[in-house]
């Protein structure tokens, strides 16, 4: 009686179980009663990453330098090329098909997490006691100057965008 299901790494065709092609190879012809499955290696710029019965391999992704892309991992017959972005840029999607410049954190905001090739800058508002007076993709919020430690007093309060202004203590008149 012909099988209705096959073992792992096999597939059912014409009422019989044929071996799947291993990763890196494509199907040329199904097995028969007398012959094994015939598989062929993917060409140099193609891949298949699973046990399969595909008749065509997939083309390696191209990391186009004109789009700011660079190769993170070269493609092989069993794995696709992995792209990432050049320094100063990050991917616009998970599949990393193009890149955009990292976002800068505006004054009043500091960098919580520096951008990578695959993620943008994460900014956070400067909390009380901290400030940022620049637009930057690297600078964190900086603490207000401590006037007391310099034997000075606060002449102008700080904000999330400006540091405090320190000045000399008023001398008491005799």
């Amino acid at each position: 009686e012909p099988p209705t299901a096959c073992r792992e790494k096999q597939y059912l065709i014409n009422s019989q179980c044929c071996s799947l092609c291993q990763p890196g190879q494509k199907l040329v012809s199904d097995c028969t009663e007398f012959t094994e499955t015939e598989c062929l290696p993917c060409s140099e710029s193609e891949f298949l990453d699973t046990w399969n019965r595909e008749t065509r391999c997939h083309q390696h992704k191209y990391c186009d330098p004109n789009l700011g892309l660079q190769v993170q991992q070269k493609g092989t017959s069993e794995t696709d090329t992995i792209c990432t972005c050049e320094e100063g840029l990050h991917c616009t999607s998970e599949s990393c098909e193009s890149c955009v410049p990292h976002r800068s954190c505006l004054p009043g905001f500091g960098v919580k997490q520096i951008a990578t090739g695959v993620s943008d800058t994460i900014c956070e508002p400067c909390p009380v006691g901290f400030f940022s007076n620049v637009s930057s993709a690297f600078e964190k919020c900086r603490p207000w100057t401590s006037c007391e430690t310099k034997d000075l007093v606060v002449q102008q309060a700080g904000t999330n965008k400006t540091d405090v202004v320190c000045g000399p203590q008023d001398r008491q008149r005799a």
Epitope: E44, Q73, T76
Partner: antibody, heavy 116, light 113 residues
Framework: EVQLVESGGGLVKPGGSLKVSCAAS????????MNWVRQAPEKGLEWIAY????????YYADTVKGRFTISRDNAKNTLFLQMTSLRSEDTAMYYC?????????WGTGTTVTVSS | DIVMTQSPSSLTVTAGEMVTMSCKSS????????????LTWFQQKPGQPPKLLIY???TRESGVPDRFAGSGSGTDFTLTISSVQAEDLAVYYC?????????FGAGTKLEIK
Amino acid sequence: EVQLVESGGGLVKPGGSLKVSCAASGFTFSDYGMNWVRQAPEKGLEWIAYISSGRSNIYYADTVKGRFTISRDNAKNTLFLQMTSLRSEDTAMYYCARSWGYFDVWGTGTTVTVSS
Amino acid sequence: DIVMTQSPSSLTVTAGEMVTMSCKSSQSLLNSGNQKNYLTWFQQKPGQPPKLLIYWASTRESGVPDRFAGSGSGTDFTLTISSVQAEDLAVYYCQNDYTYPLTFGAGTKLEIK
């Protein structure tokens, strides 16, 4: 017999141009990726360019990007490297090498000398 | 770019001795998709083009004598010649075949006493 033979090297002045070729025989040229690798006198190996079997993927080393162009003619089993804006530091032996994941066959090389 | 560091830069041995040379990469050459290390070893004899010895860190190219063996994973790799012959006089290069730009080590020059 699998063979790669480079040609077209020579003496060129700084700022000049040169096109070197690599003739392939003994294998199905259109199945393989191809590369150029150079070696300055008494120095190590430096990969400079790659072109995939179907010409869809091309990569360059930063040292030659914008100055050198790799190309291939699968009908004529030939690989090319067009070099422009040549500098003295481009003086080297230029090898072509075929690849299917690794450089398994190399040519004997052609010498390029950049000097005034 | 991945930096490949080879050591020693040169070594002199007597025929019949065992030799090991090291190659370290500045980042892992292990492809997580297929668990292969994309590290290649070449031999370059004086006046000749390089010749492939080992690919995927440990797979010997056909026709290469079995005295040549590659090992290692991730960032640390070794080429061992179990019994050096006079014809092994050459410079040995390791190469990152994991990502572009493909980069080579500076080489280890093997001299025979």
